[in-house]
Interface confidence: low
């Protein structure tokens, strides 16, 4: 049994991580990650460590954070290697050829590993209450841990699409992640959302020669706004467009441009939106073949009972507090995955809006295998 990810996320470096709560042996955890097109995760220093810590801290798993949990990671000491008491990893090593950071910049050991130069030993990440990383702990490979961490490496990623009027965002990544938010999405990720009127829309991240882009995205937002303003990618009204310092914090929707007053949007002859910041607004790049001038489309959701009210208030476009994400047209409900991963700096944003990683790795295939969610 390979449950879907409890939580996952991607950083701009092209690396994605997923955390799973499932009692299993080390080999089974490895296989579960491979089935998703990834590998058991390394948790090296710096960005990688921060990303994994963010996943853990996003919330407890089964049990509600009442006990310490152990997660399999790609850390082991091979049979012929000795315990090294003065080394940060105590003679253990990461099972990948990733260029690592300083090994000294790592978590501490919860318990010192047994001295040995003969037996192969595995290690787990122990999390206090299931959320606060305590450190590494030696564990026999045939024993069962409470969960595991997978890592996936991609050449390009799609930046999160701007919601506009969309609510109920649901991300389905190729490594069987269902989530309410992803800062960056690998090719194959499908984003479903509800536009006004509970009408669903779906777009997919695809990779081509230029980079990664959202296929079937009609314009620059998931759902067009009824008004003229967007703030942080979501529809807004003019009164909500001033920041704490009184600056104009909105951008103009497609078909409008910043007025001469610098704090309102007027009908645009060009039809190009402009970005308004707290300083001087800057113009968005013109539409290209990969980011066409928006045209409204009208997808639909029809899985409500007659006379029922919508599941989500149409004006509340928050994507981090939705308890459940239904798959359109199905009876089952997937659990929402909370994410909170910071974007890292090892990436370039292309004119088409995709993220091209400057970081290459042999950790896993750049094209993850699909994993049937019916067995998840």
């Amino acid at each position: 049994e390979h449950p879907t990810a409890d939580r996952a996320g991607c950083s701009a470096s092209g690396a994605c991580y997923s955390l799973h709560h499932a009692t299993m042996k080390r080999q089974a955890a490895e296989e579960a990650c491979i089935l998703r097109g990834g590998a058991l995760s390394t948790v090296r220093a710096g960005a990688e460590l921060r990303a994994v810590l963010a996943l853990l801290r996003a919330g407890p798993g089964p049990g509600g954070g009442s006990k310490d949990l152990l997660f399999w990671v790609a850390l082991e000491r091979r049979r012929s290697h000795c315990t090294l008491e003065n080394e940060p990893l105590r003679g253990f090593s990461w099972l990948s050829s990733d260029p690592g950071g300083l090994e000294s910049d790592t978590l501490q050991w919860v318990e010192e590993p047994q001295r040995s130069c003969t037996a192969r030993r595995c290690a787990v990440l122990q999390a206090t209450g299931g959320v606060e990383p305590a450190g590494w702990k030696e564990m026999r490979c045939h024993l069962r841990a409470n969960g595991y961490l997978c890592k996936y490496q991609f050449e390009v990623l799609c930046p999160a699409p701007r919601p506009g009027a969309a609510s109920n965002l649901s991300y389905r990544a190729p490594f069987q992640l269902h989530s309410a938010a992803l800062d960056f999405s690998p090719p194959g990720t499908e984003v479903s959302a509800l536009c006004r009127g509970q009408l669903p829309i779906s777009v997919t991240c695809i990779a081509d020669e230029i980079g990664a882009r959202w296929d079937k995205l009609s314009g620059d937002v998931l759902c067009p706004c009824p008004g003229r303003y967007l703030r942080a990618g979501k529809c807004a009204e003019l009164p909500n467009c001033l920041d704490d310092l009184g600056g104009f914090a909105c951008e103009c929707a497609t078909g409008f441009e910043l007025g001469k007053d610098g704090r309102s949007c007027v009908t645009s002859g060009e039809g190009q939106p402009t970005l308004g910041g707290t300083g001087v607004p800057t113009r968005r790049p013109p539409a290209t073949a990969t980011s066409p001038v928006p045209q409204r489309t009208w997808p639909i959701r029809v899985d409500e009972k007659l006379g029922e009210t919508p599941l989500v208030p149409e004006q509340d476009n928050s994507v981090t507090s939705i308890p459940e994400i239904p798959r359109w047209g199905s009876q089952s409900t997937m659990s929402t995955l909370q994410m909170s991963l910071q974007a890292e700096s090892k990436a370039t944003i292309t004119p088409s809006g995709s993220v091209i990683s400057k970081f290459n790795s042999t950790t896993s295939s750049a094209t993850p295998q699909a994993f049937d969610s019916s067995s998840a």
Epitope: L199, S202, V302, L306, E314, W328, G329
Partner: antibody
């Protein structure tokens, strides 16, 4: 009781125009999404257009885009379909249909009896 | 040619169970809910099943809908003469950005 009554159909020459109306009663018209669906003689159903309840946003099937305009007058509880540049293939019975509920445009839970539009020279 | 494929005709005797299929693709039935409409001779269509398997009030439980993958089906048990009508399936199609209907199935009660 929910009632939808279409009118305005008739015979028109190719290239001509026609305006269909749909008078609604028995429900809060302004709160519902409304659509037009047509059916050519002896053929199947074809969705034509929809209009939102709130801001009046409109959407059209590719076959009528640029030629047909859907609109509504909430004060009169009436839905309209302005049809320009009519073609022979637009000949059909035009039904006005109500969306499932006040927050869903589909499916169509109530239909009018239809009005026949014939485009012929 | 309709986007959703239905058999043009189906028949059965009173009391029998008849099934009408509706085949689509991942961009319509595979992604979105299926609705079924009944059109009695000379009348407007009527919503029979919505969201794959739900019956609006007033529709007898002899009518049931189901969906699997990119196909859906409407089952009518205990067939009656008044069930003789045209039946249409409908679903939203993401790639076409349109609501699409099947070509319709004419049900004859023998």
């Amino acid at each position: 009781e929910v009632q939808l009554l279409e009118s305005g159909g008739g015979l028109v020459q190719p290239g001509g125009s026609l305006r269909l109306s749909c008078a609604a009663s028995g429900f809060t018209f302004s709160g519902y999404y409304m659509s037009w669906v047509r059916q050519a003689p002896g053929k199947g159903l074809e969705w034509v257009s929809v209009i939102y309840s709130g801001d009046g946003s409109t959407y059209y099937a590719d076959s009528v885009k640029g030629r047909f305009t859907i609109s509504r007058d909430n004060s009169k509880n009436t839905l309209y379909l302005q049809m320009n540049s009519l073609r022979a293939e637009d000949t059909a019975v035009y039904y006005c249909a109500r969306g499932l509920n006040s927050s869903s445009a589909l499916p169509f839970d109530y239909w009018g009896q239809g009005t026949l539009v014939t485009v012929s020279s | 040619q309709s986007v959703l494929t239905q058999p043009p005709s189906a028949s059965g005797t009173p009391g029998q169970r008849v099934t009408i299929s509706c085949s689509g693709s991942s961009s319509n039935i595979g992604s979105n809910a299926v609705n079924w409409y009944q059109q009695l001779p000379g009348t407007a269509p009527k919503l029979l099943i919505y969201a794959d398997s739900n019956r609006p009030s007033g529709v007898p439980d002899r009518f049931s809908g189901s969906k699997s993958g990119t196909s859906a089906s409407l089952a009518i048990s205990g067939l009656r003469s008044e069930d003789e009508a045209d039946y249409y399936c409908g679903s939203w199609d993401y790639s076409l950005s349109a609501y699409v209907f099947g070509g319709g199935t004419k049900l004859t009660v023998l």
